[in-house]
């Protein structure tokens, strides 16, 4: 089946001056033999012999897509008129990186638009970009095979102090965002409640400013700010956080009632609803999914349900009245 129906009318291609009927006749009453498809491609309407003027359509194997004009036409001289067509990979292969780097998520193939994050062991940062996106058949930005981990200057500076602080004699003082943050540190996506805006900030600057008591700054996620579910949840989480009774420092982040600080990654991870402890007086009246009935949930349950991206409408704070 071809979408280019051939009614035998002579046609002129964009780049040709001659009509097909003007082409010199060559004895080839047998038509054209099967053409050779491009690498990773195949002939859709496959047969041994094609009539003059007949089209064949080039298709690509799964994971590849056609680039160029995908129809060949059988000419009277028994040859094929074929434009430049190739089958290009529509997925990216897992990049080969140095052993010290961890790829998340770890899979063999990645679809266009999917991203990976490169991370290093504790106390080290990626010496370059940490987030890469599959575009076409390659990674953007390109992944250098010499990419490695370097000692995190934040770790060196802080000594025995907390993140955002540095050792000054025997005591810990806040780092200066201007003086102590000239070195490279990984990007973080940060939300400023004052300006009600989010932006990408170097980790060092964010931690230094947070240490200097800038309570309006909230960590959203590691890596530069990019539209998507992670950012969406980060913003929603920030709104919910004002009512949280638990505020536990965890790496760059602060964990709330519905989260646990992962010891191995120093990241806040959402609990699952059944892990929520009943305690706490932060209650909400909600409607779940498409249900019409109201339910009273605690802040932990609300946080875990929203984190899991399940549909839920918060009707009002406090117990449901009915």
């Amino acid at each position: 089946f071809s979408i280019m129906e051939n009614n035998g009318q002579p046609c002129i291609n964009d780049d040709e001056e001659m009509k097909e009927v003007d082409l010199p006749e060559i004895e080839a009453d047998s038509g054209c033999p099967q053409p050779v498809p491009p690498e990773n491609g195949f002939i859709r309407n496959e047969k041994q012999l094609y009539l003059v003027g007949e089209d064949v359509e080039i298709s690509c194997l799964t994971g590849f897509e056609t680039v160029g004009y995908q129809y060949f036409r059988c000419l009277p001289d028994g040859t094929w008129r074929q434009g430049d067509v190739e089958c290009q990979r529509t997925e990216c292969i897992k990049p080969v990186v140095q052993e010290v780097l961890t790829i998340t998520p770890f899979q063999r193939l990645y679809r266009i638009g999917e991203s990976i994050e490169l991370t290093c062991p504790k106390g080290f940062v990626v010496a370059g970009p940490s987030r890469y996106t599959c575009q076409g058949n390659s990674w953007t930005p390109p992944i250098s095979n010499s990419l490695t981990c370097e000692k995190d200057t934040l770790t060196k500076l802080k000594g025995h102090c907390q993140l955002g602080q540095k050792q000054s004699g025997s005591e810990c003082i806040c780092m200066s965002p201007e003086e102590d943050c000239s070195h490279h540190s990984e990007d973080l996506c940060v939300f400023d409640t004052d300006s009600n805006d989010y932006f990408t900030s170097p980790a060092c600057k964010f931690l230094a400013e947070k240490c200097l008591n800038n309570q309006q700054l909230h960590f959203l996620h590691i890596g530069s700010c990019q539209d998507g579910r992670q950012l969406e949840w980060g913003l929603e989480r920030t709104r919910l956080s004002s009512n949280s009774t638990k505020k536990e420092s965890c790496g760059y982040d602060t964990c709330y009632d519905w989260e646990k600080c992962s010891a191995s990654t120093s990241k806040c991870v959402c609990l699952l609803p059944p892990q929520c402890f009943k305690g706490g007086n932060q209650l909400y009246c909600v409607k779940m999914g498409s249900s019409t009935s109201e339910k009273t949930l605690n802040i932990c349950e609300v946080g875990t349900i929203r984190c899991a991206n399940r549909k839920m409408e918060i009707l009002h704070p406090g117990k449901c009245l009915a």
Epitope: R229, Q230, W233, Q275, F277, K278, N309
Partner: antibody
Framework: EVQLVESDGGLVQPGGSLKLSCAAS????????MAWVRQGPTKGLEWVAT????????YYRESVKGRFTISRDNAKNTLYLQMNSLRAEDTAVYYC???????????WGHGTLVTVSS | DVVLTQTPSTLSVTPGQPVSISCRSS???????????LYWYLQKPGQSPQLLIY???DLGSGVPNRFSGSGSGTDFTLKISGVEAEDVGVYYC?????????FGAGTRLEIK
């Protein structure tokens, strides 16, 4: 110390019914969701059902929906699993389980064997 | 349902030897906010399962640090740096990233 003790299971005919209970101690029972997990000879470990603090929300695996009912009595610190229309594939050791902030199934009872056979 | 495939199905090792158990998922366990709900349990002979590792790599309470977990996406590994006699039993991975929660078929560890 958290303790979960399941009642004795037993041999039931296909199509028959059985009610399991789990006595909880060592923690405030009404503060936690509770669950049943089973371990069959062929299917391995399977989550069966979960119930919230007061029993107002229950969740089941697809294969037991409409046949099994999870319930609780907070005054008695007891979790139940009513199993109706039992099938041979329901043969398993049934465990009562409690979550923690570490995992959904952090604490387990010793288990009770339910055999469905004619 | 998400299928978790564990390899090998049986392991026979001498005490002190390191051990590695693989758990492969039929779909990614990384959710859209970056969380991965992958757990490891050990069921010793005649006992109930006990939690070893939660959230891929965090050690359960009271679990010896010879146990460690790693991985992301669809590939996960449990390692024991030096097996001890008390480590015998069946090791299970479990996922809670997708409903219903599912377990692997288990890897039996025996001591030579």
């Amino acid at each position: 110390e958290v303790q979960l003790v399941e009642s004795d299971g037993g041999l039931v005919q296909p199509g028959g019914s059985l009610k399991l209970s789990c006595a909880a101690s060592g923690f405030t029972f009404s503060d936690y969701y509770m669950a049943w997990v089973r371990q069959g000879p062929t299917k391995g470990l399977e989550w069966v059902a979960t119930i919230n603090y007061d029993g107002s929300s229950t969740y089941y695996r697809e294969s037991v929906k409409g046949r099994f009912t999870i319930s609780r009595d907070n005054a008695k610190n007891t979790l139940y699993l009513q199993m109706n229309s039992l099938r041979a594939e329901d043969t398993a050791v049934y465990y009562c389980s409690r979550p923690s902030t570490e995992a959904l199934f952090a604490y387990w009872g010793h288990g009770t064997l339910v055999t469905v056979s004619s | 349902d998400v299928v978790l495939t564990q390899t090998p199905s049986t392991l026979s090792v001498t005490p002190g030897q390191p051990v590695s158990i693989s758990c492969r998922s039929s779909q990614s366990l990384l959710n859209d906010v970056g969380n991965t709900y992958l757990y490891w349990y050990l069921q010793k002979p005649g006992q109930s399962p006990q939690l070893l590792i939660y959230l891929v790599s965090d050690l359960g309470s009271g679990v010896p640090n010879r146990f460690s977990g790693s991985g992301s996406g669809t590939d996960f590994t449990l390692k024991i740096s030096g097996v001890e006699a008390e480590d015998v039993g069946v090791y299970y991975c479990m996922q809670a990233s997708h409903a219903p929660y599912t377990f692997g078929a288990g890897t039996r560890l025996e001591i030579k």
